[in-house]
Structures are given as structure tokens and as C-alpha cells.
């Protein structure tokens, strides 16, 4: 592990209570193909344990969704990945809206520091799919 | 090659016969910007030759497509990437529907083992584009 | 840097003049979370300084956009990433249309050579968002 190849791929555990837009993640071989090798989970949120530049990627699919589902709902459904703690480093890293689609998927390179906790906020009133091939979130350390 | 940097980027060769939803891939410098360095092709399907965690990515664009094309067709057009052999390891890794769009693109980290053959199943009745900048599929070994 | 871990993540600076479809990028810690470590910017375009296979990724979000915005405009809005110079190596690497969506995001592996300049051409008449979590472009060297 001293090479710094920190890496994690997570699957959706559950959504938060009504006023909490965060998605709660889980990972580990017993759950399927998810894993944590370096980073760790803190109450369902991903915490970084090694400084560096990371590739962050995510896919979220809405449950029981058709192209009309997203347009039927007044509030736009948006997914934002950001650093939520420590508060001094709070920032949105990646943001996507579903519009008339049912899946968003993206990735980006970003510097992260030990202790950064990443949150994935799903705003709107549509439930995400928990299927492990439809909704997942991961990070990969790529260089110091 | 002993570093284990197995990597491949493939372009679409052709679709399967009517009852076979698999896409058939090809790769090699003579074909353009596709390549195989470690993994290999078995009858158009990608076979892994080294254990590890891989970043799998794909983009598929439908041919002669507009935002109304996908809604004109009754069966939803869906792309699934999975391990199709050996049968004991068969699983769907990544799945996306086109809904009212003409392109899907995503990526994920997943553990793969030597001998795993990845299949990309396009269900629905729309022909995918063969343009090399619109439809491609690749894997990258990232760590043991 | 001798390891060859060239990497860059850029944010949108501005669009080109009317007949120039290129997006102009900027990067550096003073600007936020963008950076250049190896590659360099030449008049807002990304120039590669080390041969190898790169993971290229991009996300572009249209400004003031709803699912009807893209369908209201006659010319389809398309994003193409390609090598634009040297002219002898000019090629489109990755292409996506927005259709009824407001964001495109994708990634691919491709061989790039020292001196290759990458251009990101946005055709259509819609302005892209300059928010750093909505529009970004990056490359990561992954192997020789």
C-alpha cells in the first residue's frame, strides 16, 4: 500500500432522511464488486486518507425512470459531488442535472487531501437505483 | 509489460446476428487509434489476461439518431457491460439506457481476473455508430 | 516528473470569436482546482509534452439550459475533442451531441505524442457554463 495506490469503488446503501440530500455508500467484497483500499467510509461518506490527485467518477441512475419521469417533477434532479468536510475545504467538484435522462455519469481529476470527506448530494424528489451496475461512486489516486 | 500496465481501447467492428445482443469489437494501430496491450480479443469480445482492478469505460452512440429517434422505438435501448465468461463469474458491471439521448458514456472501477471475457450487450432495435470517435470501449489496469 | 505522470485538469476560460468553435481553457491553483503538471497551454489549447497513452476526459454543461433549450435551437450542439495540430495528426478523438440534455461527459484512452495540441470544438449557438464543477477538461498519462 506504500505505493499510494489508494482506490475505492462504492455501491449505494441508502438515501438520507428527508432534509439530507446526501447519498450513503457502502463497500466491500461481501457486498459484491465494491471495495475500499486506502480510503474509508465515515457514516456512509467517503474519506480520503492520502494526499494526491484523484480521478473521481460517479454514475447515478434514477429508479423506475423513463424519459418523461424527470420532466414530470417540478424540481430539477441534480447530482453534485463535493468536499463537505472539513468545512474550510468545502467545495463542489462535479455537478450534473438529469434533465430528460435517467442516468448521469461523469469523472474528473481533482486534488484531494487526507481527511477530505466527499459527499454526493442528490437534490430533487426521485429515488436513485440501488442496482450495483446502475449506481456507483469511486475514486482512484493517480499521482502525488 | 511486467509492470502490469495492461490496457486496451477498441472500436466497433459490427453488431451480432439478430438474436445476439453483443457488440463485436476490433483493435489495432492499422485500424486507427485502437490498441490492445495485454488484453486480447476472442471473436470480438475482450478477454482479460492479468488479475487486478481495472477502470472500464465505454461510449456508444446510436446511428442516425436525434432526440426523437429513441422515443420512436418501443423497446428501450440499453447498454450493459458485464463479464459473460467464465459462466461462474457472469455479472453485469455497468448498465445505461439511452432514453431520449443518442449517446451513453460511463466508466467504473472493477476487479477482473485472468480469463474474464467482457461482453457489451446492446438491447433494443437501433444500430450503433461505427465512427471511432463516437463508439469505443476500453479497459485500463490500475492496481493489483 | 521523470516518472512521466503528466496530468492536467482545466477549467473553461472563454469561448472563441464567432467563427471559432474552440473552447479556450485555463489552469492553475490560483484559479481553483485546475492544474497543469507536464502538459502546457498554448493560447488556451492543451499541448502534450510527453508521448504515451492518455486518458482524456471532458464534461461540458450548457449555460441557462433546460431540456427544451437544446431542442429549441436548430443547429445541433455538438462537442468534439481532437488533435488539431500538427495538421498531419489532425483527428477527432471523441464526439458527443447534447440532444435534449444540457451536459455531456465522456472519457477515452488514446495515444498522444509530444507536440499534439488538443482542441475542444463546441458547435451550435449555445454558451457553455464556466462553473468549474460543470465544465472541465483533463488528460492523464497512463503508460508509455
Amino acid at each position: 500500500e506504500s505505493l499510494g495506490w489508494d482506490i475505492a469503488e462504492l455501491q449505494l446503501n441508502h438515501t438520507g432522511p428527508q432534509q439530507d440530500p446526501r447519498l450513503y455508500w457502502q463497500g466491500g467484497p461481501a457486498l459484491g464488486r465494491s471495495f475500499l483500499r486506502g480510503p474509508e467510509l465515515d457514516k456512509g461518506q467517503l474519506r480520503i486518507r492520502r494526499d494526491g490527485i484523484y480521478m473521481v467518477h460517479i454514475q447515478v441512475t434514477l429508479a423506475i425512470c423513463s424519459s418523461t419521469s424527470t420532466s414530470r417533477h417540478h424540481h430539477p434532479t441534480t447530482l453534485a459531488v463535493g468536499i463537505c468536510s472539513p468545512a474550510s475545504r468545502s467545495i463542489s467538484l462535479l455537478r450534473l442535472s438529469f434533465h430528460q435522462g435517467c442516468t448521469i455519469a461523469s469523472q474528473r481529476l481533482t486534488p484531494l487531501a487526507r481527511g477530505d470527506t466527499l459527499c454526493t448530494n442528490l437534490t430533487g424528489t426521485l429515488l436513485p437505483s440501488r442496482n450495483t451496475d446502475e449506481t456507483f461512486f469511486g475514486v482512484q489516486w493517480v499521482r502525488p | 509489460e511486467s509492470l502490469g500496465w495492461d490496457i486496451a481501447e477498441l472500436q466497433l467492428n459490427h453488431t451480432g446476428p439478430q438474436q445476439d445482443p453483443r457488440l463485436y469489437w476490433q483493435g489495432g494501430p492499422a485500424l486507427g487509434r485502437s490498441f490492445l496491450r495485454g488484453p486480447e480479443l476472442d471473436k470480438g469480445q475482450l478477454r482479460i489476461r492479468r488479475d487486478g482492478i481495472y477502470m472500464v469505460h465505454i461510449q456508444v452512440t446510436l446511428a442516425i439518431c436525434s432526440s426523437t429517434s429513441t422515443s420512436r422505438h418501443h423497446h428501450p435501448t440499453t447498454l450493459a457491460v458485464g463479464i459473460c465468461s467464465p459462466a461462474s463469474r457472469s455479472i453485469s458491471l455497468l448498465r445505461l439506457s439511452f432514453h431520449q439521448g443518442c449517446t451513453i458514456a460511463s466508466q467504473r472501477l472493477t476487479p477482473l481476473a485472468r480469463g474474464d471475457t467482457l461482453c457489451t450487450n446492446l438491447t433494443g432495435t437501433l444500430l450503433p455508430s461505427r465512427n471511432t470517435d463516437e463508439t469505443f470501449f476500453g479497459v485500463q489496469w490500475v492496481r493489483p | 516528473e521523470s516518472l512521466g505522470w503528466d496530468i492536467a485538469e482545466l477549467q473553461l476560460n472563454h469561448t472563441g470569436p464567432q467563427q471559432d468553435p474552440r473552447l479556450y481553457w485555463q489552469g492553475g491553483p490560483a484559479l481553483g482546482r485546475s492544474f497543469l503538471r507536464g502538459p502546457e497551454l498554448d493560447k488556451g489549447q492543451l499541448r502534450i509534452r510527453r508521448d504515451g497513452i492518455y486518458m482524456v476526459h471532458i464534461q461540458v454543461t450548457l449555460a441557462i439550459c433546460s431540456s427544451t433549450s437544446t431542442s429549441r435551437h436548430h443547429h445541433p450542439t455538438t462537442l468534439a475533442v481532437g488533435i488539431c495540430s500538427p495538421a498531419s495528426r489532425s483527428i477527432s478523438l471523441l464526439r458527443l451531441s447534447f440532444h435534449q440534455g444540457c451536459t455531456i461527459a465522456s472519457q477515452r484512452l488514446t495515444p498522444l505524442a509530444r507536440g499534439d495540441t488538443l482542441c475542444t470544438n463546441l458547435t451550435g449557438t449555445l454558451l457553455p457554463s464556466r462553473n468549474t464543477d460543470e465544465t472541465f477538461f483533463g488528460v492523464q498519462w497512463v503508460r508509455p
Epitope: - | L12, L62, I64, R72, H73, T125, L127, S129 | -
Partner: antibody, heavy 120, light 111 residues
Framework: QVQLQQSGPGLVQPSQSLSITCTVS????????VHWVRQSPGKGLEWLGV???????DYNAAFISRLSISKDNSKSQVFFKMNSLQSDDIAIYYC??????????????WGQGTSVTVSS | DIVLTQSPASLAVSLGQRATISCRAS??????????MHWYQQKPGQPPKLLIY???NLESGVPARFSGSGSGTDFTLNIHPVEEEDAATYYC?????????FGAGTKLELK
């Protein structure tokens, strides 16, 4: 096996409408689209319109004001109606199946044709 | 609309020889890595029959003596060796966009 059977009158009075039913077998209208094409000595083969598996239709702009295509999936029937026929609408009218790939827009199986004369 | 021009309007070929029919489109019918051009055969009193799709793909059940080639705006249907049952009219059709259009046809006769 795949078949498309057309039924409808061969004689239509000027300014009246033409109705043809295309009954299909060997495939489902929920999967395949059906095109309508006509053939006349003067104009050759002309594409008139298509009804997709979803029931959505596309028409040739030259006929859009007087053409209607609909279907009944449960009866495996496609209905073609053209209004205001004139002498230059004299032709053989065909229904034809779109191949499996919906965006291919070719025609792999054809009905036997309905020969239409416009006369009072 | 895309206009398809076929040539020749008619041709006479001896048994066993090669028949070549051309179809030129008023604009390219290539997109997405395919050429959206198809070929049909029609005999008197019968509907057209699909022979070739996407410029060069042989429809199931069609004899291998039929072949298609071309891209962009210029396409060719070849029949070799010509057999007696090949006497018919041949049409090209594009599907690059709506409306679909057909060529005017080429009548193949046997010498």
C-alpha cells in the same frame, strides 16, 4: 413466416379517400416499424410514411396534409388512409416491414400491393 | 430531399457475364460509419425484394453473385455471373434521412 397481407378497394372516386389495411404475421408490430410506399409509371417508387413500433409516425412532407397511418398491435394491423385522391395518385400502394434495426430504414418484406385507380 | 440517379436506365447482358448498375446520390448518404444505401430487385407483377443493405451487406437468402459497393455519393450493384432469373428492374434507396427516396430504376435484360 413473415407476411404482410393488404386489403382495400382498388377503385376510388376523385376527391375521396383511400383506406388500406395491412395485416401482418410472423412478427410483432411492437418491435418492427411498417413503411408505406407507392409505385406509379410516372413517378416510380415514392416513400409515403412510416409507423414506428411505438405508434409514432413520420410522413413524407409532400403528403403530410392528407395522409394518416395508424395501427392496432393486438390485431397485427396497420391502417393507411390518404384523403383527396386525384388522378396523379393512381399507383400500386405497398406496405413493407422495416428490418430489425429501427434506424436502418430499409424494407425487407413487402405486401402484395394494392392497385389503386381514381375514377368516377 | 436526396435525389438518387441510376445509370444506365437499361442494359442487356449475356448469361454468365457481369452486370454493373450505378447509383449516384445528390449528397453523401454516409454517416455513423455506414453507407445508408440499399438495393432492391423487382420483377413484373411482384413487389420489390431487398438484395443489399448498408451498401454492401447481402440480405439473407440472396445469392452471393449479387454484391454492392461504394460510399459517400457513388454506389454500385454488381451481378456476376448473371443468370436468367436475374432479368428484372433494380432500384437503389437511401435512408440517410427522411424522406426516404428511390432511384428511377435500371432494367436488366438478357441478350
Amino acid at each position: 413466416q413473415v407476411q404482410l397481407q393488404q386489403s382495400g378497394p382498388g377503385l376510388v372516386q376523385p376527391s375521396q379517400s383511400l383506406s388500406i389495411t395491412c395485416t401482418v404475421s410472423g412478427f410483432s408490430l411492437t418491435t418492427y416499424a411498417v413503411h408505406w410506399v407507392r409505385q406509379s409509371p410516372g413517378k416510380g417508387l415514392e416513400w409515403l410514411g412510416v409507423i414506428w413500433s411505438t405508434g409514432i409516425t413520420d410522413y413524407n412532407a409532400a403528403f403530410i396534409s392528407r395522409l394518416s397511418i395508424s395501427k392496432d398491435n393486438s390485431k397485427s394491423q396497420v391502417f393507411f388512409k390518404m384523403n383527396s385522391l386525384q388522378s396523379d395518385d393512381i399507383a400500386i400502394y405497398y406496405c413493407a416491414r422495416n428490418p430489425y434495426y429501427g434506424n436502418l430504414n430499409a424494407m425487407d418484406y413487402w405486401g402484395q400491393g394494392t392497385s389503386v385507380t381514381v375514377s368516377s | 430531399d436526396i435525389v438518387l440517379t441510376q445509370s444506365p436506365a437499361s442494359l442487356a447482358v449475356s448469361l454468365g457475364q457481369r452486370a454493373t448498375i450505378s447509383c449516384r446520390a445528390s449528397k453523401s448518404v454516409d454517416t455513423s460509419g455506414y453507407s445508408f444505401m440499399h438495393w432492391y430487385q423487382q420483377k413484373p407483377g411482384q413487389p420489390p425484394k431487398l438484395l443489399i443493405y448498408l451498401a454492401s451487406n447481402l440480405e439473407s437468402g440472396v445469392p452471393a453473385r449479387f454484391s454492392g459497393s461504394g460510399s459517400g455519393t457513388d454506389f454500385t450493384l454488381n451481378i456476376h455471373p448473371v443468370e436468367e432469373e436475374d432479368a428484372a428492374t433494380y432500384y437503389c434507396q437511401h435512408s440517410r434521412e427522411l424522406p426516404l427516396t428511390f432511384g428511377a430504376g435500371t432494367k436488366l435484360e438478357l441478350k
